[in-house]
Interface confidence: low
Amino acid sequence: MTSQRSPLAPLLLLSLHGVAASLEVSESPGSIQVARGQPAVLPCTFTTSAALINLNVIWMVTPLSNANQPEQVILYQGGQMFDGAPRFHGRVGFTGTMPATNVSIFINNTQLSDTGTYQCLVNNLPDIGGRNIGVTGLTVLVPPSAPHCQIQGSQDIGSDVILLCSSEEGIPRPTYLWEKLDNTLKLPPTATQDQVQGTVTIRNISALSSGLYQCVASNAIGTSTCLLDLQVISPQPRNIGLIAGAIGTGAVIIIFCIALILGAFFYWRSKNKEEEEEEIPNEIREDDLPPKCSSAKAFHTEISSSDNNTLTSSNAYNSRYWSNNPKVHRNTESVSHFSDLGQSFSFHSGNANIPSIYANGTHLVPGQHKTLVVTANRGSSPQVMSRSNGSVSRKPRPPHTHSYTISHATLERIGAVPVMVPAQSRAGSLV
């Protein structure tokens, strides 16, 4: 008798298959978020109708930081637990006593590097078929670290400034909120804020912009703050000096013109009076007192400490000439000053913006209120300047001496050494 295959055989096989236990891993919540350092529980449960004698569970992770390198987290096989990758040693375990149908695990002291996709793979022979893998995403969150606050740009009135705020750490990426710590907690009306970048741009800052500003960095699990003190700077006296100097310079130019006319007038009048007198040499003088020691060194212009610190530059031997004329008044203001005799005046250019210059190859540093005085001797015996052992001695001269301030053209015409005259403000700072 030949055996004949029943047409019901496939159905019988199916029914037998149905009798065999079918393992099924339950749906997981999809993803879990946990703050760094806190424990995480990764769920995985399954159903089976077979005994748990041959239960085999492997937890694997595909780290977000290295998706090409899956790692074993923990293993249960043959009734024993085995650790996975070394970085999980001592931090991972099953939440319940094994064997069990709840094969969830905990991870203690979670680290940023634990972020990734975790898979539990469950086998429980003789179970066959069904879904034997559960997948859970783990994201380790990091609160914002203390942010850094800083100011970019000039804090002068009318300037634009940017307040910057950034945290080195924070997952998810923090947002940044700036506020002014006054009664309103509102930023100035000219401020625009970028909460993603952590910047506030304040345009055209005024005194009202001054004050304490706070940046709050925040994300899903925490906040952190930093403070910044914005002090808007008012115009400096230095700037006021420049404005005053500009006005003064205008006045000075007018006075200078008058002085030139007067100077020319006196010059020509005296010249016409004494035509018969022979011409005598001219000296370039400085209306300053002699220093205690005047050594003749290689050409060097010094800043002396007399009232008006006049400066005279001569040629290579640093000879100095001093005016003994008591009629030359020491005046540090930006005005022309006339002597009581009407025959002597000194002029000080107050705020001309003259840079340091080079004369005779030497760098001249501008001094304080330099005055150039040309003295024309009218007596028959001019003062004799003698120089011995490097010092300059002075011999008396007749009393008939007139001091004039002469124009540059006139100086050149009479053969005087041309000198640029640097000037400074009264306080001694350059202008």
Epitope: L75, D83, G84, A85, P86, R87, G90, R91, N109
Partner: antibody, heavy 119, light 111 residues
């Protein structure tokens, strides 16, 4: 600086037990694990097992399972390795080594303890 | 699982470079970036020279470098010096229940 100082040499009879200590200093003991590695005379290195000083979890090499026990005393920052039922082929220098739990290498080693099993 | 495979010995002259190989499987060397190298002088404890395949601990000369290709890791020592003469061991993390495998060791001789 990190130091692991082990107990002195031991001579044991077959069947006896030995307990070797490893005192750690210069770092936070509970932040690392301790591994034990042995080296028979003229032979290579053999990993014996690992203990977490953080929570006392252990993993032992399969061939030593049941004969070895590793423990720690966090109050003294000391790790211990006990090997029972000694045999002559257990004669070796036993080293403790610090294990950063996140990388798997043995970054600092003790000076070694010679255990001689002889009848 | 058996030990990782290393050559029993290598040699080189001072100033030369040498390379020591360490061959495993995809379950150990090839599967993880947890390969370390140790130097052991006679009568001394081993010293970590390279960890995680390529990283050098502080205090170790930059003449020592590590690399990995597939299931084989390598230690290269450049500009050999007399004090480099020692036995070198590799080890690798491997999945449980073995966890740690050592190579058999390579004796480096500086000629």
């Amino acid at each position: 600086q990190v130091q692991l100082v082990q107990s002195g040499a031991e001579v044991k009879k077959p069947g006896a037990s030995v307990k070797v200590s490893c005192k750690a200093s210069g770092y936070t003991f509970t932040s690392y694990g301790i591994s034990w590695v042995r080296q028979a005379p003229g032979q290579g290195l053999e990993w014996m097992g690992w203990i977490s000083a953080y929570n006392g979890n252990t993993n032992y090499a399969q061939k030593l399972q049941g004969r070895v026990t590793m423990t720690t005393d966090t109050s003294t920052s000391t790790a211990y390795m006990e090997l029972r039922s000694l045999r002559s082929d257990d004669t070796a220098v036993y080293y403790c080594a610090r294990v950063p739990a996140w990388s798997g290498q043995f970054d600092y080693w003790g000076q070694g303890t010679l255990v001689t099993v002889s009848s | 699982q058996s030990a990782l495979t290393q050559p029993a010995s290598v040699s080189g002259s001072p100033g030369q470079s040498i390379t020591i190989s360490c061959t495993g499987t995809s379950s150990d060397v090839g599967g993880y970036n947890y390969v370390s190298w140790y130097q052991q002088h006679p009568g001394k404890a081993p010293k970590l020279m390279i960890y995680e395949v390529t990283n050098r601990p502080s205090g170790v000369s930059d003449r020592f470098s590590g690399s990995k290709s597939a299931n084989t890791a390598s230690l290269t020592i450049s500009e050999l010096q007399a004090e480099d003469e020692a036995v070198y061991y590799c080890n690798s993390y491997t999945s449980g229940p073995t966890y740690v495998l050592f190579g058999g060791g390579t004796q480096l001789t500086v000629l």
